[in-house]
Amino acid sequence: MKVLQEPTCVSDYMSISTCEWKMNGPTNCSTELRLLYQLVFLLSEAHTCIPENNGGAGCVCHLLMDDVVSADNYTLDLWAGQQLLWKGSFKPSEHVKPRAPGNLTVHTNVSDTLLLTWSNPYPPDNYLYNHLTYAVNIWSENDPADFRIYNVTYLEPSLRIAASTLKSGISYRARVRAWAQCYNTTWSEWSPSTKWHNSYREPFEQH
Protein backbone atom coordinates (compact mmCIF):
# COMPACT_ATOMS: atom_id res chain seq x y z
CA MET A 1 0.00 0.00 0.00
CA LYS A 2 1.47 3.32 -1.10
CA VAL A 3 0.47 6.96 -1.35
CA LEU A 4 0.16 8.01 -4.97
CA GLN A 5 -0.72 11.68 -4.38
CA GLU A 6 0.44 13.14 -1.08
CA PRO A 7 -2.12 14.79 1.21
CA THR A 8 -2.98 18.40 0.50
CA CYS A 9 -4.97 20.33 3.07
CA VAL A 10 -7.07 23.47 3.27
CA SER A 11 -8.37 25.19 6.39
CA ASP A 12 -11.56 27.15 6.97
CA TYR A 13 -9.54 29.15 9.53
CA MET A 14 -12.04 28.34 12.20
CA SER A 15 -12.57 24.73 13.17
CA ILE A 16 -12.02 22.35 10.26
CA SER A 17 -9.17 21.54 7.92
CA THR A 18 -9.78 19.13 5.06
CA CYS A 19 -7.02 16.90 3.71
CA GLU A 20 -7.27 14.87 0.52
CA TRP A 21 -4.92 12.30 -0.99
CA LYS A 22 -4.84 9.36 -3.39
CA MET A 23 -3.62 5.84 -2.82
CA ASN A 24 -2.03 3.62 -5.47
CA GLY A 25 -5.10 1.43 -5.70
CA PRO A 26 -8.66 0.98 -4.42
CA THR A 27 -8.65 1.49 -0.64
CA ASN A 28 -11.20 1.31 2.13
CA CYS A 29 -9.98 4.53 3.69
CA SER A 30 -11.94 4.33 6.94
CA THR A 31 -10.83 0.83 7.86
CA GLU A 32 -7.30 0.78 6.49
CA LEU A 33 -5.94 4.28 7.17
CA ARG A 34 -5.56 6.79 9.97
CA LEU A 35 -4.32 10.38 9.76
CA LEU A 36 -2.69 11.59 12.97
CA TYR A 37 -2.31 15.33 13.44
CA GLN A 38 -0.80 17.42 16.21
CA LEU A 39 -0.30 21.13 16.74
CA VAL A 40 3.37 21.93 17.28
CA PHE A 41 2.90 23.35 20.76
CA LEU A 42 3.86 22.32 24.28
CA LEU A 43 0.31 21.71 25.49
CA SER A 44 -1.04 19.93 22.43
CA GLU A 45 -1.85 16.26 22.04
CA ALA A 46 -2.10 14.05 18.96
CA HIS A 47 -5.53 13.58 17.40
CA THR A 48 -6.71 10.89 15.03
CA CYS A 49 -8.79 11.50 11.93
CA ILE A 50 -10.68 8.60 10.34
CA PRO A 51 -10.70 9.21 6.58
CA GLU A 52 -13.61 8.67 4.22
CA ASN A 53 -13.49 7.44 0.65
CA ASN A 54 -13.43 10.05 -2.07
CA GLY A 55 -13.56 7.98 -5.24
CA GLY A 56 -11.95 4.57 -5.62
CA ALA A 57 -8.39 5.38 -4.55
CA GLY A 58 -9.07 8.79 -3.03
CA CYS A 59 -9.40 9.58 0.66
CA VAL A 60 -10.55 12.68 2.52
CA CYS A 61 -10.19 13.56 6.19
CA HIS A 62 -11.79 16.38 8.16
CA LEU A 63 -9.42 17.53 10.90
CA LEU A 64 -11.17 19.16 13.85
CA MET A 65 -9.30 22.14 15.27
CA ASP A 66 -10.22 24.00 18.43
CA ASP A 67 -9.14 27.35 17.05
CA VAL A 68 -6.65 28.67 14.51
CA VAL A 69 -4.04 31.42 14.79
CA SER A 70 -1.61 32.50 12.11
CA ALA A 71 1.52 30.85 13.55
CA ASP A 72 -0.04 27.38 13.90
CA ASN A 73 1.79 24.46 12.36
CA TYR A 74 0.59 20.85 12.45
CA THR A 75 2.50 17.62 11.98
CA LEU A 76 0.66 15.03 9.90
CA ASP A 77 1.31 11.27 9.94
CA LEU A 78 -0.57 8.91 7.64
CA TRP A 79 -0.66 5.35 8.98
CA ALA A 80 -1.82 2.02 7.58
CA GLY A 81 -1.89 -0.10 10.71
CA GLN A 82 1.65 -0.02 12.08
CA GLN A 83 3.14 1.24 8.81
CA LEU A 84 3.91 4.96 8.41
CA LEU A 85 3.01 5.77 4.80
CA TRP A 86 3.69 9.50 4.80
CA LYS A 87 4.86 12.25 7.12
CA GLY A 88 4.34 15.95 6.53
CA SER A 89 3.26 19.25 8.00
CA PHE A 90 0.51 21.78 7.42
CA LYS A 91 0.26 25.46 8.24
CA PRO A 92 -3.46 26.38 8.14
CA SER A 93 -2.90 30.11 7.61
CA GLU A 94 -1.05 29.39 4.36
CA HIS A 95 -3.85 27.24 2.91
CA VAL A 96 -7.13 28.95 3.70
CA LYS A 97 -10.40 28.33 1.93
CA PRO A 98 -13.06 30.47 3.64
CA ARG A 99 -16.44 29.14 4.60
CA ALA A 100 -19.22 29.95 2.16
CA PRO A 101 -21.51 32.89 3.01
CA GLY A 102 -25.05 31.97 3.98
CA ASN A 103 -28.59 33.29 4.14
CA LEU A 104 -28.50 35.03 0.77
CA THR A 105 -31.69 37.07 0.44
CA VAL A 106 -32.93 39.30 -2.37
CA HIS A 107 -35.07 42.22 -1.24
CA THR A 108 -37.17 43.46 -4.16
CA ASN A 109 -39.41 46.01 -2.47
CA VAL A 110 -37.00 48.96 -2.38
CA SER A 111 -38.08 51.40 -5.13
CA ASP A 112 -36.72 49.64 -8.21
CA THR A 113 -33.51 48.75 -6.40
CA LEU A 114 -32.48 45.19 -5.70
CA LEU A 115 -30.85 44.72 -2.30
CA LEU A 116 -28.96 41.48 -1.86
CA THR A 117 -27.84 40.60 1.67
CA TRP A 118 -26.04 37.59 3.08
CA SER A 119 -24.37 36.52 6.30
CA ASN A 120 -20.68 36.60 7.07
CA PRO A 121 -19.75 32.95 7.74
CA TYR A 122 -17.42 33.83 10.64
CA PRO A 123 -18.11 34.98 14.19
CA PRO A 124 -16.88 38.48 15.11
CA ASP A 125 -13.94 37.17 17.14
CA ASN A 126 -12.48 35.31 14.14
CA TYR A 127 -9.71 37.12 12.28
CA LEU A 128 -11.39 36.60 8.91
CA TYR A 129 -14.63 38.27 10.01
CA ASN A 130 -13.29 41.73 9.13
CA HIS A 131 -11.22 40.64 6.14
CA LEU A 132 -13.66 39.00 3.74
CA THR A 133 -14.61 40.41 0.39
CA TYR A 134 -17.21 38.85 -1.85
CA ALA A 135 -18.23 38.08 -5.39
CA VAL A 136 -21.93 37.99 -6.26
CA ASN A 137 -22.97 36.01 -9.31
CA ILE A 138 -26.34 36.82 -10.90
CA TRP A 139 -27.65 34.93 -13.91
CA SER A 140 -30.82 34.49 -15.89
CA GLU A 141 -32.51 31.11 -15.88
CA ASN A 142 -33.75 31.83 -19.40
CA ASP A 143 -30.63 33.20 -21.05
CA PRO A 144 -27.24 31.55 -20.32
CA ALA A 145 -25.48 34.58 -21.79
CA ASP A 146 -27.04 36.84 -19.16
CA PHE A 147 -24.44 36.08 -16.51
CA ARG A 148 -22.68 38.69 -14.41
CA ILE A 149 -20.29 38.99 -11.46
CA TYR A 150 -20.29 41.89 -9.00
CA ASN A 151 -17.22 42.31 -6.81
CA VAL A 152 -18.02 43.52 -3.31
CA THR A 153 -14.76 44.93 -1.97
CA TYR A 154 -16.22 46.61 1.11
CA LEU A 155 -16.88 44.77 4.37
CA GLU A 156 -20.66 45.01 4.50
CA PRO A 157 -22.27 41.78 3.26
CA SER A 158 -24.71 43.44 0.90
CA LEU A 159 -25.06 44.63 -2.67
CA ARG A 160 -27.43 47.19 -4.20
CA ILE A 161 -28.12 47.22 -7.90
CA ALA A 162 -30.77 48.94 -9.98
CA ALA A 163 -33.45 46.47 -11.00
CA SER A 164 -33.30 48.04 -14.45
CA THR A 165 -29.80 46.67 -15.04
CA LEU A 166 -31.50 43.29 -15.36
CA LYS A 167 -34.25 42.33 -17.77
CA SER A 168 -37.79 42.76 -16.56
CA GLY A 169 -40.31 39.99 -16.39
CA ILE A 170 -37.91 37.06 -16.09
CA SER A 171 -36.46 34.99 -13.26
CA TYR A 172 -32.92 35.41 -11.99
CA ARG A 173 -30.74 33.51 -9.57
CA ALA A 174 -27.95 34.79 -7.36
CA ARG A 175 -25.18 33.24 -5.32
CA VAL A 176 -22.23 34.63 -3.39
CA ARG A 177 -18.75 33.49 -2.43
CA ALA A 178 -15.96 34.94 -0.30
CA TRP A 179 -12.22 35.31 -0.12
CA ALA A 180 -9.68 37.10 2.06
CA GLN A 181 -6.76 38.97 0.57
CA CYS A 182 -4.85 39.06 3.85
CA TYR A 183 -4.13 35.32 3.71
CA ASN A 184 -4.23 35.07 -0.09
CA THR A 185 -7.00 32.53 0.28
CA THR A 186 -8.74 30.57 -2.41
CA TRP A 187 -12.37 31.41 -3.07
CA SER A 188 -14.95 29.77 -0.87
CA GLU A 189 -17.58 27.52 -2.35
CA TRP A 190 -20.62 29.33 -3.68
CA SER A 191 -23.50 29.84 -1.29
CA PRO A 192 -26.78 28.12 -2.14
CA SER A 193 -28.48 30.17 -4.84
CA THR A 194 -31.68 32.12 -4.37
CA LYS A 195 -34.28 32.89 -7.04
CA TRP A 196 -36.50 35.88 -7.68
CA HIS A 197 -38.70 37.29 -10.41
CA ASN A 198 -37.34 40.58 -11.68
CA SER A 199 -39.97 43.19 -12.47
CA TYR A 200 -39.83 46.94 -12.38
CA ARG A 201 -41.80 49.84 -13.83
CA GLU A 202 -40.45 51.07 -17.13
CA PRO A 203 -39.92 54.84 -17.00
CA PHE A 204 -42.81 56.71 -18.72
CA GLU A 205 -41.68 57.96 -22.08
CA GLN A 206 -43.08 61.28 -23.35
CA HIS A 207 -43.37 61.95 -27.09
Partner: antibody, heavy 120, light 106 residues
Amino acid sequence: DVQLQESGPGLVKPSQSLSLTCTVTGYSITSDYAWNWIRQFPGNKLEWMGYISYSGSSSYNPSLKSRISITRDTSKNQFFLQLNSVTTDDTATYYCAGGGLRRRGLFDYWGQGTTLTVSS
Amino acid sequence: QIVLSQSPAILSASPGEKVTMTCRATSSVTYMHWYQQKPGSSPKPWIYATSNLASGVPARFSGSGSGTSYSLTISRVEAEDTATYYCQQWSSIPLTFGAGTKLELK
Protein backbone atom coordinates in the same frame (compact mmCIF):
# COMPACT_ATOMS: atom_id res chain seq x y z
CA ASP B 1 -16.80 32.92 35.71
CA VAL B 2 -13.38 31.35 36.35
CA GLN B 3 -11.64 32.58 39.49
CA LEU B 4 -8.31 31.67 41.08
CA GLN B 5 -7.38 32.40 44.69
CA GLU B 6 -3.93 31.92 46.23
CA SER B 7 -3.43 31.26 49.91
CA GLY B 8 -0.28 30.81 51.94
CA PRO B 9 1.75 31.83 55.00
CA GLY B 10 2.99 35.31 54.08
CA LEU B 11 6.24 34.87 56.03
CA VAL B 12 8.71 31.97 55.84
CA LYS B 13 12.13 31.56 57.45
CA PRO B 14 15.21 30.89 55.32
CA SER B 15 15.95 27.19 54.62
CA GLN B 16 12.33 26.24 55.33
CA SER B 17 9.78 25.04 52.79
CA LEU B 18 7.08 27.21 51.24
CA SER B 19 3.61 25.79 50.56
CA LEU B 20 0.97 27.68 48.61
CA THR B 21 -2.53 26.66 47.55
CA CYS B 22 -4.51 27.85 44.52
CA THR B 23 -8.25 27.26 44.67
CA VAL B 24 -10.02 27.34 41.31
CA THR B 25 -13.74 28.05 41.07
CA GLY B 26 -15.95 28.08 37.98
CA TYR B 27 -13.86 25.54 36.08
CA SER B 28 -12.61 22.02 36.64
CA ILE B 29 -8.82 21.76 36.67
CA THR B 30 -9.13 18.36 34.98
CA SER B 31 -11.07 19.73 31.99
CA ASP B 32 -8.39 21.75 30.25
CA TYR B 33 -5.55 24.20 30.83
CA ALA B 34 -2.13 24.12 32.38
CA TRP B 35 -2.27 25.44 35.93
CA ASN B 36 0.79 27.56 36.58
CA TRP B 37 2.70 29.26 39.34
CA ILE B 38 4.34 32.56 38.44
CA ARG B 39 6.13 34.94 40.76
CA GLN B 40 6.96 38.62 40.57
CA PHE B 41 10.02 39.90 42.37
CA PRO B 42 10.17 43.29 44.11
CA GLY B 43 11.73 44.87 40.98
CA ASN B 44 8.68 43.65 38.98
CA LYS B 45 10.52 40.89 37.09
CA LEU B 46 8.16 38.01 36.31
CA GLU B 47 9.32 34.40 36.53
CA TRP B 48 7.41 31.31 35.45
CA MET B 49 7.93 28.54 38.00
CA GLY B 50 6.06 25.59 36.55
CA TYR B 51 2.69 24.06 35.77
CA ILE B 52 0.56 20.99 36.27
CA SER B 53 -1.64 20.23 33.30
CA TYR B 54 -5.26 19.14 33.32
CA SER B 55 -4.04 15.58 32.69
CA GLY B 56 -1.74 15.69 35.70
CA SER B 57 1.62 16.01 33.94
CA SER B 58 3.94 18.73 35.21
CA SER B 59 6.73 20.89 33.88
CA TYR B 60 9.13 23.07 35.86
CA ASN B 61 11.54 25.91 35.32
CA PRO B 62 14.98 24.22 35.22
CA SER B 63 16.36 26.95 37.51
CA LEU B 64 14.02 25.64 40.26
CA LYS B 65 13.81 21.98 39.36
CA SER B 66 15.66 20.63 42.38
CA ARG B 67 13.46 22.62 44.81
CA ILE B 68 9.98 22.73 43.29
CA SER B 69 6.96 20.46 43.26
CA ILE B 70 3.48 21.23 41.89
CA THR B 71 0.69 18.85 42.82
CA ARG B 72 -3.11 18.93 42.85
CA ASP B 73 -6.21 17.72 44.65
CA THR B 74 -8.86 17.22 42.00
CA SER B 75 -11.61 16.59 44.57
CA LYS B 76 -11.09 20.10 45.96
CA ASN B 77 -10.22 21.65 42.58
CA GLN B 78 -6.96 22.95 44.02
CA PHE B 79 -3.33 22.85 42.98
CA PHE B 80 -0.31 23.44 45.14
CA LEU B 81 3.21 24.82 45.07
CA GLN B 82 5.94 23.51 47.29
CA LEU B 83 9.32 25.25 47.20
CA ASN B 84 12.07 23.85 49.39
CA SER B 85 15.13 25.50 50.95
CA VAL B 86 13.90 29.05 50.47
CA THR B 87 16.22 32.05 50.71
CA THR B 88 15.60 35.77 50.82
CA ASP B 89 15.82 35.68 47.00
CA ASP B 90 12.45 33.90 46.99
CA THR B 91 10.71 36.97 48.42
CA ALA B 92 8.08 37.82 45.81
CA THR B 93 4.39 38.03 44.99
CA TYR B 94 3.22 34.56 43.95
CA TYR B 95 0.46 34.18 41.37
CA CYS B 96 -1.40 31.13 40.17
CA ALA B 97 -2.61 31.31 36.59
CA GLY B 98 -4.38 29.13 34.02
CA GLY B 99 -3.21 28.97 30.42
CA GLY B 100 -4.76 26.73 27.78
CA LEU B 101 -4.35 25.39 24.30
CA ARG B 102 -7.12 27.52 22.80
CA ARG B 103 -5.18 30.75 23.16
CA ARG B 104 -1.86 29.01 22.71
CA GLY B 105 -0.89 29.13 26.36
CA LEU B 106 -1.93 32.68 27.13
CA PHE B 107 -2.43 32.98 30.89
CA ASP B 108 -6.16 33.73 30.63
CA TYR B 109 -6.89 33.59 34.33
CA TRP B 110 -4.81 34.94 37.23
CA GLY B 111 -5.21 34.99 40.95
CA GLN B 112 -4.81 38.31 42.74
CA GLY B 113 -1.44 37.20 44.12
CA THR B 114 -0.10 36.47 47.57
CA THR B 115 2.94 38.23 48.97
CA LEU B 116 5.63 36.04 50.46
CA THR B 117 8.50 37.38 52.55
CA VAL B 118 11.47 35.19 53.42
CA SER B 119 13.07 36.52 56.55
CA SER B 120 14.47 35.24 59.81
CA GLN C 1 16.43 29.51 27.75
CA ILE C 2 14.86 32.14 25.51
CA VAL C 3 15.58 35.63 26.81
CA LEU C 4 13.08 38.35 25.89
CA SER C 5 14.37 41.94 25.72
CA GLN C 6 11.79 44.72 25.74
CA SER C 7 12.45 48.24 24.56
CA PRO C 8 12.17 50.94 25.53
CA ALA C 9 12.08 50.32 29.27
CA ILE C 10 10.03 53.51 29.72
CA LEU C 11 7.86 55.04 27.03
CA SER C 12 6.46 58.54 27.49
CA ALA C 13 3.62 59.59 25.21
CA SER C 14 0.97 62.26 24.82
CA PRO C 15 -2.71 61.37 24.59
CA GLY C 16 -3.68 60.61 20.98
CA GLU C 17 -0.12 59.71 20.02
CA LYS C 18 0.79 56.43 18.28
CA VAL C 19 3.30 54.32 20.19
CA THR C 20 5.12 51.06 19.53
CA MET C 21 7.05 48.89 21.95
CA THR C 22 9.17 45.93 20.90
CA CYS C 23 10.12 42.54 22.26
CA ARG C 24 13.14 40.69 20.89
CA ALA C 25 13.90 37.04 21.58
CA THR C 26 17.27 35.29 21.58
CA SER C 27 15.72 32.39 19.62
CA SER C 28 12.76 32.09 17.30
CA VAL C 29 9.39 32.09 19.03
CA THR C 30 6.14 30.71 17.61
CA TYR C 31 3.63 32.24 20.01
CA MET C 32 4.23 35.60 21.66
CA HIS C 33 1.78 36.93 24.21
CA TRP C 34 1.43 40.35 25.87
CA TYR C 35 0.06 41.34 29.28
CA GLN C 36 -0.89 44.66 30.79
CA GLN C 37 -0.22 45.27 34.48
CA LYS C 38 -1.24 48.22 36.59
CA PRO C 39 0.19 48.87 40.09
CA GLY C 40 -1.35 46.65 42.75
CA SER C 41 -3.03 44.32 40.24
CA SER C 42 -2.14 41.03 38.65
CA PRO C 43 -1.18 41.03 34.96
CA LYS C 44 -4.08 40.97 32.51
CA PRO C 45 -4.00 39.00 29.25
CA TRP C 46 -3.80 41.58 26.48
CA ILE C 47 -2.68 40.08 23.16
CA TYR C 48 -2.25 36.40 22.41
CA ALA C 49 -0.38 34.53 19.69
CA THR C 50 1.21 37.69 18.30
CA SER C 51 -1.80 39.59 17.00
CA ASN C 52 -5.06 38.45 18.62
CA LEU C 53 -6.67 40.78 21.14
CA ALA C 54 -7.80 39.24 24.41
CA SER C 55 -11.39 39.77 25.51
CA GLY C 56 -12.25 43.39 26.26
CA VAL C 57 -9.04 44.88 24.85
CA PRO C 58 -9.72 48.08 22.84
CA ALA C 59 -9.22 47.92 19.07
CA ARG C 60 -6.59 50.69 19.23
CA PHE C 61 -4.17 47.97 20.35
CA SER C 62 -2.50 45.70 17.82
CA GLY C 63 0.32 43.21 17.78
CA SER C 64 2.62 41.97 15.06
CA GLY C 65 5.89 40.18 14.46
CA SER C 66 7.42 36.80 13.81
CA GLY C 67 10.56 34.85 14.56
CA THR C 68 12.61 36.85 17.04
CA SER C 69 11.01 40.29 16.72
CA TYR C 70 7.56 41.29 17.97
CA SER C 71 5.80 44.55 18.70
CA LEU C 72 2.75 45.99 20.41
CA THR C 73 1.28 49.19 18.97
CA ILE C 74 -1.31 51.60 20.35
CA SER C 75 -2.76 53.71 17.54
CA ARG C 76 -3.95 56.52 19.81
CA VAL C 77 -2.82 56.44 23.42
CA GLU C 78 -5.41 57.13 26.11
CA ALA C 79 -4.92 57.85 29.80
CA GLU C 80 -6.23 54.40 30.78
CA ASP C 81 -3.38 52.77 28.83
CA THR C 82 -0.86 53.90 31.46
CA ALA C 83 0.61 50.58 32.65
CA THR C 84 3.51 48.20 32.24
CA TYR C 85 3.35 45.81 29.29
CA TYR C 86 5.10 42.44 29.37
CA CYS C 87 5.77 40.06 26.51
CA GLN C 88 5.87 36.32 27.18
CA GLN C 89 6.77 33.29 25.08
CA TRP C 90 5.34 29.79 25.24
CA SER C 91 7.54 28.12 22.65
CA SER C 92 10.05 26.41 24.88
CA ILE C 93 10.57 25.55 28.53
CA PRO C 94 11.16 27.55 30.59
CA LEU C 95 8.40 29.96 29.66
CA THR C 96 9.88 33.43 29.94
CA PHE C 97 8.73 37.03 30.28
CA GLY C 98 10.31 40.27 29.14
CA ALA C 99 11.29 42.85 31.75
CA GLY C 100 8.42 45.11 30.68
CA THR C 101 7.84 48.46 29.04
CA LYS C 102 6.33 51.10 31.29
CA LEU C 103 4.00 53.43 29.40
CA GLU C 104 3.65 56.88 30.94
CA LEU C 105 1.54 59.81 29.82
CA LYS C 106 3.10 63.23 29.33
